[in-house]
Interface confidence: low
């Protein structure tokens, strides 16, 4: 009943709670003297389903048979309509449509930790749409039973609040869950288990790692576990990896030696526990321990290259370059590089520690045989030194690689190809391809890049430190014992026409011809490798086509003579520059009048 129902009653048969698909009879009847005031036959009783009229009848009572009610709750309300007045609510009723509970499935119980309590879960099956009571029963040895109820419509979990103890770990316990509502009841199949089956240990805690003598090869992982734990699983991985290494250990008693860790690497460690070899379940993984392994002395050898520059008749400048060791080779933080320079015949040697750089420059006499050794040092020791004899890398003409070419290969890559030297190609021990940004004036501060290539290779793809629209000076060295030959070429990964032409800074007269001097185009405006300069000239105030002279680009050249100008004629001159992609705009214009005699 949904209100006081002072004026009448609504009855529902067979019940307020019905099985889905059933029919109900709803009767609305007025109490004596509760009809319309003047004339009772004018009583009009109306039955509403929620707020929609479904039936009406004149008189003291109304019968209605209702079918097809949906799952859930439906509200019926009976109202009285009298002439010249609003409808009056008489009474109402809620009808609950549902189904009997299905048999609960997959009943499983667990006790989290040796001190935890037994809790069970199950699958309810389809929703009953009715108030359903679940009773969970646990029976154990010595006729002990425990019972817990839950009256939640969605109940699928109950905690007994009792703790199973390991006194008799093989004793059997049986759990069963029963669901009951107004339309029926159903029980799960019994689930039988022992202490060892259902206790899921707590994850290990207080995880620590120790490195004996600060060595990665003597590493022990420690943790704490509940008392009955028999098995542990360890998993660990470098922090930047997605793949775990797994180890299973028995009777570890809270410690395990790890033998395969890499030095100077941050690792993540987790541990899980189990009480029995084949019974029960694994604990959750522990919290992660993150720890960095100690350093070990570097392995591997530095890749060292060098450059020689003539200073004067007695001195030369040597610039050494080397590449960082990989993380796996450095095995720690590299604190410094040790460079040793030695004159081989006289035995003089100097050693220097370099920090913060991967290059070193010094001046040595042009006489004598010189060698260098470079090694990397961390807190545990040094790498094996890389030894190089300083030689004239381009001295042996017969060792010079032939037909060197450099072609753009996609974004920011250059493919360098060559042919083996004329001299017996089998004499070549390795090729070195070297590249650096082309700077007029040969700036020695420009970073040097190189890669080594096996003697049977005749190409190399260079991609490190390659930028678009920049011209690179590329050299290919063929090395054989203490001899070397080289060839060079200019190359770029991407080019377009230069943004500006050269700036003519002077025109001077020399014996009936002129010498034009210009400033180089700024590197950032060259837009790749320059192939040619063009010098244009025409008579001032003339509409004729200008004449031109095309000069192959050479890095160091910034002047050129022209001897085809007529004396005492004023000319306008300008210059452009060309890459493979096209010609620049004009540089500045200069006027000049040759003063010399006519031919």
């Amino acid at each position: 009943k949904i209100d006081a129902c002072k004026r009448g009653d609504v009855t529902v048969k067979p019940s307020h709670v019905i099985l889905l698909g059933s029919t109900v009879n709803i009767t609305c009847s007025l109490k004596p003297r509760q009809g319309c005031f003047h004339y009772s036959r004018r009583n009009k009783l109306i039955l509403y389903k929620f707020d929609r009229r479904i039936n009406f009848h004149h008189g003291h009572s109304l019968n209605s048979q209702v079918t097809g009610l949906p799952l859930g709750t439906t509200l019926f309300v009976c109202k009285l309509a009298c002439i010249n007045s609003d409808e009056i609510q008489i009474c109402g009723a809620e009808i609950f449509v549902g189904v009997a509970p299905e048999q609960p499935q997959n009943l499983s119980c667990i006790q989290k930790g040796e001190q935890g309590t037994v809790a069970c879960t199950w699958e309810r099956g389809r929703d009953t749409h009715l108030y359903t009571e679940y009773t969970l029963q646990l029976s154990g040895p010595k006729n002990l039973t425990w019972q817990k109820q839950c009256k939640d419509i969605y109940c699928d979990y109950l905690d007994f609040g009792i703790n199973l103890t390991p006194e008799s770990p093989e004793s059997n316990f049986t759990a069963k869950v029963t669901a009951v509502n107004s339309l029926g009841s159903s029980s799960s199949l019994p689930s039988t288990f022992t202490f060892l089956d259902i206790v899921r240990p707590l994850p290990p805690w207080d995880i620590r790692i120790k490195f004996q003598k600060a060595s990665v090869s003597r590493c022990t992982l420690y943790w704490r576990d509940e008392g009955l734990v028999l098995l542990n699983r360890l998993r660990y991985r470098p922090s930047n990896s997605r793949l775990w290494n797994m180890v299973n250990v028995t009777k570890a008693k809270g410690r395990h030696d790890l033998l395969d860790l890499k030095p100077f690497t941050e690792y993540e460690f987790q541990i899980s526990s189990k009480l029995h070899l084949y019974k029960g379940s694994w604990s959750d993984w522990s919290e992660s321990l993150r720890a960095q392994t100690p350093e070990e002395e570097p392995t591997g050898m530095l890749d060292v290259w060098y450059m020689k520059r003539h200073i004067d008749y007695s001195r030369q400048q040597i610039s050494l370059f080397w590449k960082n060791l990989s993380v796996s080779e450095a095995r720690g933080k590299i604190l410094h590089y040790q460079v040793t320079l030695q004159e081989l015949t006289g035995g003089k040697a100097m050693t220097q520690n370099i920090t913060g750089h991967t290059s070193w420059t010094t001046v040595i006499p042009r006489t004598g045989n010189w060698a260098v050794a470079v090694s990397a040092a961390n807190s545990k020791g040094s790498s094996l030194p890389t030894r190089i004899n300083i030689m004239n890398l381009c001295e042996a003409g017969l060792l010079a690689p032939r037909q060197v070419s450099a072609n753009s290969e996609g974004m920011d890559n250059i493919l360098v190809t060559w042919q083996p030297p004329r001299k017996d190609p089998s004499a070549v021990q390795e090729y070195v391809v070297e590249w650096r940004e082309l700077h007029p004036g040969g700036d020695t501060q420009v970073p040097l890049n190189w890669l080594r290539s096996r003697p049977y290779n005749v190409s190399a793809l260079i991609s490190e430190n390659i930028k678009s629209y920049i011209c690179y000076e590329i050299r290919v060295y063929a090395l054989s014992g203490d001899q070397g030959g080289c060839s060079s070429i200019l190359g770029n990964s991407k080019h377009k026409a230069p943004l500006s032409g050269p700036h003519i800074n002077a025109i001077t007269e020399e014996k009936g011809s002129i010498l034009i001097s210009w400033n180089s185009i700024p590197v950032q405006e060259q837009m790749g490798c320059l192939l040619h300069y063009r010098i244009y000239w025409k008579e001032r105030d003339s509409n004729s086509q200008p004449q031109l002279c095309e000069i192959p680009y050479r890095v160091s050249q910034n002047s050129h003579p022209i001897n085809s100008l007529q004396p005492r004629v004023t000319y306008v001159l300008w210059m452009t520059a060309l890459t493979a992609a096209g010609e620049s705009s004009h540089g500045n214009e200069r006027e000049f009048c040759l003063q010399g005699k006519a031919n």
């Epitope: 994850p203 805690w205 207080d206 995880i207 620590r208 959750d284 522990s286 919290e287 992660s288 321990l289 993150r290 720890a291």
Partner: nanobody
């Protein structure tokens, strides 16, 4: 490196309540712990309370005997924030309260086990 910022400290009367917050930013992990320590003038820093996150849930809380039953630690993993609810405050609770975080798992109340520290927030309880 985890950065920690405490807030909520102020002057209160004995018997009052106060809630401190500690927000963590930077490199945070799915498994680590956060705790509160305090240092009264002229005294050593002492442990107050700590909790452990495990995969986003708090699976363990721990209190110093002197605050048990009066202080409560909680956290919001989504916000990387830990709170210290302090009830029935006493004059002896006056101190600078520091938030600390650790990715190591050792003794909870040992300040050497914590790798990151906040600047501290002053709590003064007047009687």
């Amino acid at each position: 490196e985890v950065q920690l910022v405490e807030s909520g400290g102020r002057l209160v009367q004995a018997g009052d309540s106060l809630r401190l917050s500690c927000a963590a930013s930077g490199r945070t992990f799915t498994s680590y712990r956060m705790g509160w320590f305090r240092q009264a003038p002229g005294k050593e820093r002492e442990f107050v309370s700590a909790l452990r996150w495990s995969s986003g849930n708090i699976d363990y809380t721990y209190y110093a005997d002197s605050v048990k039953g009066r202080f409560s630690i909680s956290g919001d993993y989504a916000k990387n924030t830990v709170y210290l609810q302090m009830n029935s405050l006493k004059a002896e609770d006056t101190a600078v309260y520091y938030c600390a975080a650790s990715t190591r798992w050792g003794v909870m109340e040992s300040d050497t086990e914590y790798t990151s520290w906040g600047q501290g927030t002053q709590v003064t309880v007047s009687s």
